[in-house]
């Protein structure tokens, strides 16, 4: 049976709206929930596309609005259609289309031919896409001043660029409890908006924002050491696109150290954790004397998946330790703000030469030189750092 509705189903998840002049909005389309394809044609009263129009069309993959009266597509029009991959807006009345409209979409093709597009910086992104052959862009006409049938590139004098963003930071070292003033300087044409992204800072400082384009200020009040390795980001947008810059505020604090008991892995490991900013220098003592590192006994840092913390974890790695390595291990950590030490006793092997009154007295033996700290370990797999 032929469909007499404004919009008729096509297959299990398509909708076709072609009865001339019957739509002025896409809001409230019936059965829109599972829609993957929407085809709209000959709708001269359909002039605007706002984000509310496509709400509830989360599965939409293909949208065609052609030979209609579309003059404006909101920058956030496709906020609720993240799966959209085919967009055809040809033969409408569009003079421009913001880069924000398609941001976040994985478009495979975009067709804008037959629109009176006006060449301006606001369409610079589109020209770039077309030049770079991205996602099958079809525009055919870009008008500089009046109607014309060829692609008219922006004049060489026209300087279209995203904003330039710079963050000014304190030169002096920052300590726990300080207030830190950051300033974000934005330069560029047709600046629209700018702000800070401070999601990583929760609990690390109290934040006060002030100022507006082109200069935004930020005060981090009563900073803690948790602020280290956390990104403070300033972003800005204009017609051409978005730029952002991130910095990290380094908050100095004294060295601290923690040692664990020796554990046997492929080799022996005395685990440690050290913290401090700047990163502390480390030194090991064995029974009170400086321990000289060798390929048999050395410091090995563990690769951390967490890049947002100052604490470093590692091992004093001992290959093949014997009784001469039994004793007291001390790790000293120091930075300009303080020093710390931690000690642990380790016993790797009984001394075969220790005298026990119950044992028969041996006729002769050669005691091992007890001063050596380089005698040592166990084994290690080829890609377990390290030997």
């Amino acid at each position: 049976a032929s469909c007499r509705e404004v919009c008729c189903p096509v297959g299990p998840s398509g909708l076709r709206c072609t009865r001339a002049g019957s739509l002025d909005t896409l809001r409230g389309l019936r059965g829109a929930g599972n829609l993957t394809e929407l085809y709209v044609e000959n709708q001269q009263h359909l002039q605007r596309l706002e984000f509310e129009d496509l709400q509830g069309l989360g599965e939409l993959r293909s949208l065609t609005i052609v030979k209609s009266g579309l003059r404006f597509v909101a920058p956030d029009a496709f906020r609720f259609t993240p799966r959209l991959s085919h967009l055809n807006l040809s033969s409408n009345a569009l003079e421009s289309l913001s880069w924000k409209t398609v941001q976040g979409l994985s478009l495979q093709d975009l067709t804008l031919s037959g629109n009176p597009l006006h060449c301006s910086c606001a369409l610079f992104w589109l020209q770039r896409w077309e030049q770079e052959g991205l996602c099958g862009v079809h525009t055919q006409t870009l008008h500089d001043s009046g109607p014309g049938d060829q692609f008219l590139p922006l004049g060489h004098n026209t300087s279209c660029g995203v904003p330039t963003v710079k963050i000014q930071m304190p030169n002096d070292s920052v300590e726990v409890g300080d207030d830190v003033f950051l300033q974000c300087q934005v330069e560029g044409l047709a600046l629209q908006q700018a702000d800070w992204i401070l999601t990583e800072l929760e609990g690390a400082a109290t934040v006060k924002k002030f100022g507006d384009l082109p200069s935004l200020g930020l005060i981090l009040v009563n900073v803690t050491s948790d602020l280290n390795k956390k990104n403070v980001t300033c972003w800005a947008e204009n017609d051409v696109g978005r730029a952002e810059v991130s910095v990290q505020v380094s908050v100095s604090f004294p060295a601290s150290v923690h040692l664990g008991l020796a554990v046997e892995q492929h080799h022996w490991c005395i685990p440690f954790s050290v913290d401090g900013q700047p990163a502390p220098s480390l030194r090991w003592l064995f029974n009170g004397s400086v321990l000289n590192e060798t390929s048999f006994i050395f410091t090995q840092f563990l690769e951390s998946a967490l890049t947002n913390e100052t604490m470093r974890h590692g091992c004093l790695r001992l290959n093949q330790p014997t009784h001469v390595n039994n004793g007291n291990y001390t790790l000293l950590a120091a930075n300009p703000y303080g020093q710390a030490a931690a000690s642990v006793m380790a016993a790797f092997m009984d001394n075969p030469f220790e005298f026990n009154p119950e044992d028969p007295i041996p006729v002769s033996f050669s005691p091992v030189d007890g001063n050596s700290t380089s005698r040592d370990p166990v084994e290690k797999k080829d890609e377990t750092p390290f030997g």
């Epitope: 048999f296 093949q320 091992v368 040592d376 750092p385 030997g387």
Partner: antibody, heavy 118, light 107 residues
Framework: QVQLQQPGAELVKPGASVKLSCKAS????????MHWVKQRPGQGLEWIGE????????NYDEKFKTKATLTIDKSSRTAYIQLSSLTSEDSAVYYC???????????WGQGTLVTVSA | DIQMTQSPASLSATVGETVTITCRAS??????VAWYQQKQGKSPQLLVH???TLAEGVPSRFSGSGSGTQFSLKINGLHPEDFGSYYC?????????FGAGTKLELK
């Protein structure tokens, strides 16, 4: 697979210095100490010293402390040995070597033959 | 430093024969000894580590034994490719030292 690449030969004059290279591939370079071993023609093997590629820390046999200097270039994954004030006694093959799964030299370079001659 | 005294300095044998090379350490080094084979003009190759563990790919006719100060490398039934020089080495701290070597020649 693990490879340690060394140039084949160097001819140097007495009193001069020479810098030999050992380019590592096939493993995490900073995770294993690099060792250097000397072998004079028809003679045995002598351990010269070792270097930690992670931090440049070095240890030498007493005999080679004034003769050899070990260095590292992390970016090119290359270890170097510089031999100074060369005499005929320094004419030898110089090997770089690294431990394998255990603390023994499972991997060796091909060796560089240094000839000290006027 | 730990001295490694290797004997004999040279050895003549025929294909199929069994030979033993010994190494004595100047102090107790537990089982921290490695053995290497070296052919003329080539780099040494690891045969045995930790006194008796065969390195990867080493034929089972090679075997190592010993602990403390006395160690030996035995080749059961010599193959033509086994002729060359053999070195022991302690891996019990630095400085690492090698034995003077044993030259195994075809009789």
């Amino acid at each position: 697979q693990v490879q340690l690449q060394q140039p084949g030969a160097e001819l140097v004059k007495p009193g001069a210095s020479v810098k030999l290279s050992c380019k590592a591939s096939g493993y995490t370079f900073t995770s294993y100490w690099m060792h250097w071993v000397k072998q004079r023609p028809g003679q045995g093997l002598e351990w010269i010293g070792e270097i930690n590629p992670n931090n440049g820390l070095t240890n030498y046999d007493e005999k080679f402390k004034t003769k050899a200097t070990l260095t590292i270039d992390k970016s090119s994954r290359t270890a170097y040995i510089q031999l100074s004030s060369l005499t005929s006694e320094d004419s030898a093959v110089y090997y770089c070597a690294k431990y394998g799964n255990y603390v023994a030299f499972a991997f060796w370079g091909q060796g560089t033959l240094v000839t000290v001659s006027a | 430093d730990i001295q490694m005294t290797q004997s004999p300095a040279s050895l003549s044998a025929t294909v199929g024969e069994t030979v033993t090379i010994t190494c004595r350490a100047s102090e107790n080094i537990y089982s921290y000894v490695a053995w290497y084979q070296q052919k003329q003009g080539k780099s040494p190759q690891l045969l045995v580590h930790n006194a008796k563990t065969l390195a990867e790919g080493v034929p089972s006719r090679f075997s190592g034994s010993g602990s403390g100060t006395q160690f030996s490398l035995k080749i059961n039934g010599l193959h033509p490719e086994d002729f060359g020089s053999y070195y022991c080495q302690h891996h019990y701290g630095i400085p690492l030292t090698f034995g003077a070597g044993t030259k195994l020649e075809l009789k």
